[in-house]
Amino acid sequence: VTCDDYYYGFGCNKFCRPRDDFFGHYACDQNGNKTCMEGWMGPECNRAICRQGCSPKHGSCKLPGDCRCQYGWQGLYCDKCIPHPGCVHGICNEPWQCLCETNWGGQLCDKDLNYCGTHQPCLNGGTCSNTGPDKYQCSCPEGYSGPNCEI
């Protein structure tokens, strides 16, 4: 039995006609099975295959090879969270966080908790002590005075 165009199988009871539109992107093999065009997958070949490495959790695509990030995520693979706007010395594990690096504090991680180490403000052999975010105190050796032992 010879089947009409686009019909396949025993009894010609399978239909497959190549298409490349909203409903699917496929060709047909000799048995009438849909074979997805490059970059497409799914039962109807209407699901794009995203860029290799694109985060399945935070990225998606409507066109093959693309990787569009969900709100709050960034990067080529949508695997990097976007920190809180204005976050200076901090990172995030989830979007909009600002987790401070060592020796930094405050909501935007812009307060220096180790002012002594970062700025070494005490002169003339003075001993520096961190007293709070962006605050320090110098203990001056005999013969020196002033906030930074500069006198």
Partner: antibody, heavy 116, light 107 residues
Framework: QVQLVQSGAELKKPGASVKVSCKVS????????IHWIRQAPGQGLEWMGI????????KYAQKFQGRVTMTVDTSTSTAYMELSSLRSEDTAVYYC?????????WGQGTLVTVSS | DIQMTQSPSSLSASVGDRVTITCRTS??????LTWYQQKPGKAPKLLIY???ILDSGVPSRFSGSGSGTDFTLTISSLQPEDFATYYC?????????FGGGTKLEIK
Amino acid sequence: QVQLVQSGAELKKPGASVKVSCKVSGYAFTDYAIHWIRQAPGQGLEWMGIINTYYGDSKYAQKFQGRVTMTVDTSTSTAYMELSSLRSEDTAVYYCARGYDGFAYWGQGTLVTVSS
Amino acid sequence: DIQMTQSPSSLSASVGDRVTITCRTSENIYSYLTWYQQKPGKAPKLLIYNAKILDSGVPSRFSGSGSGTDFTLTISSLQPEDFATYYCQHHYDIPWTFGGGTKLEIK
């Protein structure tokens, strides 16, 4: 087995909106598109639109453009059809259906009555 | 939009008769045509898809033919449960329009 279960009957006033749900079970929800079809009393079938359940993209018949919104909630395997600015001519049974090569599976239908 | 012209709009026949319903489209839809049966108060039931493929569980007395713009649904020997309304629909491109329906009544 595949099932599409729709929300109950609605009575609406002209100018209002209605939102009909279609909860799916028995297959992977995002594998198949959902279509919406309506049938006015004593009339034929009218195709309203289709939604790609994976992406949430929809295409509507010109007649309903601007008045209909089709959405999906993949977490609950539910499709929704909202029709706004209702008028008496929108009184109909609204069906959801699954398929690409015709509709092998249909919801039971939701009667929407628009009356003042 | 593709227009679907279904004929006849109504038809009286007897049990055992051979019945033919036709559907003509305004442009070539290849074989993207479906036939449905609907009984009062029920959702339509898929009979035939892609013009001639019988859906599973549909009796073999139903058959479909045609391609391009002219399609036919044939019931070879009418049974009492076949009295219903029949619709054709294309699924070639958006919008997927339906024919106007054919009401099949007992003579």
